[in-house]
C-alpha cells in the first residue's frame, strides 16, 4: 500500500495557506479538481472544486477558498485566506474521474492554525498595494456527490472548515471576474 505522507503548515489566525498540488499533466489537465478536509473518524468532505471541465488558470472561490488550475503546468493552486483556528486539520487535493473513485494527490496537508498574529506574514500573507474585490459571480460548477465505501465527498456544510457565506468577499491582489461558487447550507 502507498504510504500517505503529510506536509505540515503552522500558521496564525488571519494568515493564508497557499499550497500547490501537482498532477500528471497528460491524464488530468481538464479533469475536475477538489480540495477536501479529512476529519478524524469521518469520510473526506469536499470544500471546493474547480469547474467541469476545469478551466485553465480561472480562479474559483468558495467562501475563503480559492482554487486555480494551471493546465499547462500540471498544478493546482489552493489558497485558504483569513485562516481560523477551526480550520486546523488534514487536507488533500483530489481529482474527480467518474465513474471511478477520486484520485488523491500527494502530499496531504496538515494545517495547524493558532491564535494571535505574529506580525510576520506566513505562507502567503500578502502585503499588497493594489487590492481588488472579487465580484460575487456564480458558476454552474458543482462538486459531485460521491458515496463509495472508501471516499465520500459532499458539498460543504456550514460548519466545515468555517467556510464563509455566499455574501462574503475576499481581498486578493488583482483578482476580478473570478468564478464564485455558492456555499450550500
Amino acid at each position: 500500500a502507498t504510504k500517505l505522507t503529510e506536509e505540515k503548515y503552522e500558521l496564525k489566525e488571519g494568515q493564508t495557506l497557499d499550497v500547490k498540488c501537482d498532477y500528471t499533466l497528460e491524464k488530468f489537465a481538464s479533469s475536475q479538481k477538489a480540495w477536501q478536509i479529512i476529519r478524524d473518524g469521518e469520510m473526506p468532505k469536499t470544500l471546493a472544486c474547480t469547474e467541469r471541465p476545469s478551466k485553465n488558470s480561472h480562479p474559483v472561490q468558495v467562501g475563503r477558498i480559492i482554487l486555480e488550475d494551471y493546465h499547462d503546468h500540471g498544478l493546482l493552486r489552493v489558497r485558504m485566506v483569513n485562516l481560523q483556528v477551526e480550520d486546523s486539520g488534514l487536507y488533500q487535493c483530489v481529482i474527480y474521474q467518474p465513474p471511478k473513485e477520486p484520485h488523491m494527490l500527494f502530499d496531504r496537508i496538515r494545517l495547524v492554525v493558532t491564535k494571535g498574529f505574529s506580525g510576520t506574514p506566513g505562507s502567503n500573507e500578502n502585503s499588497t498595494q493594489n487590492v481588488y474585490k472579487i465580484p460575487p459571480t456564480t458558476t454552474k460548477a458543482l462538486c459531485p456527490l460521491y458515496t463509495s465505501p472508501r471516499t465520500v465527498t459532499q458539498a460543504p456544510p456550514k460548519s466545515t472548515a468555517d467556510v464563509s457565506t455566499p455574501d462574503s468577499e475576499i481581498n486578493l491582489t488583482n483578482v476580478t471576474d473570478i468564478i464564485r461558487v455558492p456555499v450550500f447550507n
Epitope: S57, E68, P121, T128, T173, D177, I178
Partner: antibody
C-alpha cells in the same frame, strides 16, 4: 513559436518619458499576464509591475507608482510600458515577460521573455 | 516586501561538478519560488517554477527543492553552457522580488 518581441533602444533626456512595446505571438495573448522587469547595468533584476492581458488589471512596484503605466492592446497582442519623469538611474534594459495567471500575478514565474529594450537616460 | 537572499554570490566550478545554490526568503512563501538562468546580454530563462517543477525544455540536471523559507537549486553535473548567473524569485506576494544572483564561473 511563442515569443515576445520588444521595440528598439531609446535614448532619453532626464524628465522625458519612454514607451516600450512588447508584441506577443504564438499563444493566446489574453490567457496570460505580462510582467515588466528591468536590469540596470551590472545589477540584478527588478520587478516593475504586472498587467493582466485578460482584463487589464495592473499591479505596480511601489517605488514606481505614479510614474509607470502598463497597458495592453488585445487587437494586436501587444503590451506597453510607459515610464515618465525619467532619471539617470532609470537607465537599464527593460524586459517584458509572460506569466501564467490571468488574475493575480504570475505564481509560476515568467516563462517567456522579450529580448530586452535598452533605455539610456542622459543629459 | 519579502527579501530574497541568495548564497553564494559567486561560485567557481569545473565541468562535471555538482553545484548547489541556496535562496532564503525573509518570510514563508510556501512553494512559490522560481529559478532563472541569465547569460551576459541575454534575457533570463525560466528553469524551475513552484520550487521543484522543471520548466519544459530545461535539462534534467537542473533540480529545485525546498518550501517555506529555504530553497535550493542544484546542477547535478555542470556543463559548459551552464556558466551563467542564476536568480531566484518569490512569486506569491506582491511585489515579486528577486535574489541578488549567483554567478557560476569557470574554475
Amino acid at each position: 513559436q511563442v515569443q515576445l518581441v520588444q521595440s528598439g533602444a531609446e535614448v532619453k533626456k532626464p524628465g522625458a518619458s519612454v514607451k516600450v512595446s512588447c508584441k506577443a505571438s504564438g499563444y493566446t495573448f489574453t490567457s496570460y499576464g505580462i510582467s515588466w522587469v528591468r536590469q540596470a547595468p551590472g545589477q540584478g533584476l527588478e520587478w516593475m509591475g504586472w498587467i493582466s492581458a485578460y482584463n487589464g488589471n495592473t499591479n505596480y512596484a511601489q517605488k514606481l507608482q505614479g510614474r509607470v503605466t502598463m497597458t495592453t492592446d488585445t487587437s494586436t497582442s501587444t503590451a506597453y510600458m510607459e515610464l515618465r519623469s525619467l532619471r539617470s538611474d532609470d537607465t537599464a534594459v527593460y524586459y517584458c515577460a509572460r506569466g501564467a495567471g490571468m488574475y493575480d500575478g504570475s505564481p509560476l514565474g515568467m516563462d517567456v521573455w522579450g529580448q530586452g529594450t535598452t533605455v539610456t537616460v542622459s543629459s | 516586501d519579502i527579501q530574497m537572499t541568495q548564497s553564494p554570490s559567486s561560485v567557481s566550478a569545473s565541468v562535471g561538478d555538482r553545484v548547489t545554490i541556496t535562496c532564503r526568503a525573509s518570510q514563508g512563501i510556501s512553494s512559490w519560488l522560481a529559478w532563472y538562468q541569465q547569460k551576459p546580454g541575454k534575457a533570463p530563462k525560466l528553469l524551475i517554477y513552484a520550487a521543484s517543477n522543471l520548466q519544459s525544455g530545461v535539462p534534467s540536471r537542473f533540480s529545485g527543492s525546498g518550501s517555506g523559507t529555504d530553497f535550493t537549486l542544484t546542477i547535478s553535473s555542470l556543463q559548459p553552457e551552464d556558466f551563467a548567473t542564476y536568480y531566484c524569485q518569490q512569486a506569491t506576494a506582491h511585489p515579486p522580488t528577486f535574489g541578488g544572483g549567483t554567478k557560476v564561473e569557470i574554475k
